[in-house]
């Protein structure tokens, strides 16, 4: 009989993984995918990947843009793929940013959008991130 | 449009093998994984087996497990089913399924190929 | 293993008039992270692979007519057919995704009175 593979888990998303945490894997599973932008001594730096815990995402995920950072958040297998997160244009508020995906379903409304509005840094995500 | 064309099916007598497979269009196939799900006659379904997008997991319900090999041709785009020590309790109508991007429920279904086994 | 258990078995409704299925699994399948039942509705008509209607307990597959709504949550799901039609006659079957094995209610066939 041949080798038993892992068990698949039918909660974990696959996502599109890109950035120095990826390794050389060009893919990761998680349960939320994301795609972030943040500025790292004045370059742009674009990063895709997953976060593993639903939990690890929900406050990431919840975060509205900054100047120096987005993160865009989303659901369903490869949903990354074509997500390119983008910072807020200079001197315009959003307040009423929706920066969460969900394919085929109801975008978080704007009230969902509170909470703690803490910065995730480019550390944190990769530390979210699945190697 | 979506398509999946089960093949492979037939009479086989117990204990031999039967290789099914399901050629996939309309997708892009090595995005997602695929299913097995059978129907005895008469009766309701069930689940079979998967197979990730890559092969690199793989699973099986209790029934199949150690007969049965799933595997893909990404290149092909077509999923295997190989069935050994077949056993008359196996005789359904097997079809194949593509899972959905949002969990692992079925958007598209074959028409599926029957496997009757008897002697 | 999560076992489905559908009732009733069979059911006659006249034309126009509710349908109500009932589904039951084992254990739950809404998973509290982020809040979705792991449960899907197909309808299968006689000759026919299943089609999917309804996933995450209650959102309606493109293209499903609105005269098919499902509810429930945890252990507890129903799929409703509101004003049913002829074409409506088929086997529905439940099937929760939220572990492996995946595993299917014994199904319901719906017929006319």
């Known amino acids: 009989m041949e080798d038993e593979k892992p068990k698949v888990n039918p909660k974990l998303y696959m996502c599109v993984c890109e950035g120095l945490s990826c390794g050389n894997e060009d893919h990761c599973e998680g349960q939320q995918c994301f795609s972030s932008l943040s500025i790292n001594d004045g370059f742009h730096v674009y990063q895709k990947g997953c976060f593993q815990v639903y939990e690890q995402g929900k406050m990431t995920c919840k975060t509205p843009p900054s100047p120096g950072q987005a993160v865009e958040c989303c659901q369903g297998d490869w949903c990354n793929r074509n997500i390119t997160a983008q910072l807020p244009t200079k001197g315009k508020s959003f307040p009423g940013t929706q920066n969460f995906h969900l394919e085929e379903q109801k975008l978080i409304s704007e009230e969902d959008l509170g909470g703690e509005q803490k910065l995730i840094s480019e550390e944190d995500l990769h530390h979210h991130h699945h190697h | 449009e979506v398509q999946l064309v089960e093949s492979g099916g037939g009479l086989v007598q117990p204990g031999r093998s039967l290789r099914l497979s399901c050629a996939a269009s309309?997708?892009?196939?090595?995005?997602?994984?695929m299913h097995w799900v059978r129907q005895a006659p008469g009766k309701g379904l069930e689940w079979v087996s998967v197979i990730s997008w890559n092969s690199a997991t793989i699973d099986y319900a209790d029934s199949v497990k150690g007969r049965f090999t799933i595997s893909r041709d990404n290149a092909k785009n077509s999923l295997f089913l190989q069935m050994n020590s077949l056993r008359p309790e196996d005789t359904a109508l097997y079809y194949c399924a593509k899972k959905n991007s949002l969990g692992w429920f079925f958007d598209y279904w074959g028409q599926g190929t029957l496997v009757t086994v008897s002697s | 293993d999560i076992v489905m258990t559908q009732s009733p078995d069979s059911l006659a409704v006249s034309l126009g008039e509710r349908a109500t299925i009932n589904c039951k699994s084992s254990q739950s399948v809404l998973y509290s992270s982020n809040d979705n039942n792991y449960l899907a509705w197909y309808q299968q008509k006689p000759g026919q692979p299943p089609k999917l209607l309804i996933y995450w307990a209650s959102t309606r597959e493109s293209g499903v007519p609105d005269r098919f709504s499902g509810s429930g949550s945890g252990t507890d799901f129903t799929l409703t057919i509101s004003s049913l039609q002829a074409e409506d006659v088929a086997v529905y079957y439940c099937q929760q995704y939220y572990s492996t094995p995946l595993t299917f209610g014994g199904g319901t066939k719906v017929e006319i009175k």
């Open positions: 309309g997708f892009t196939f090595d995005d997602y994984g």
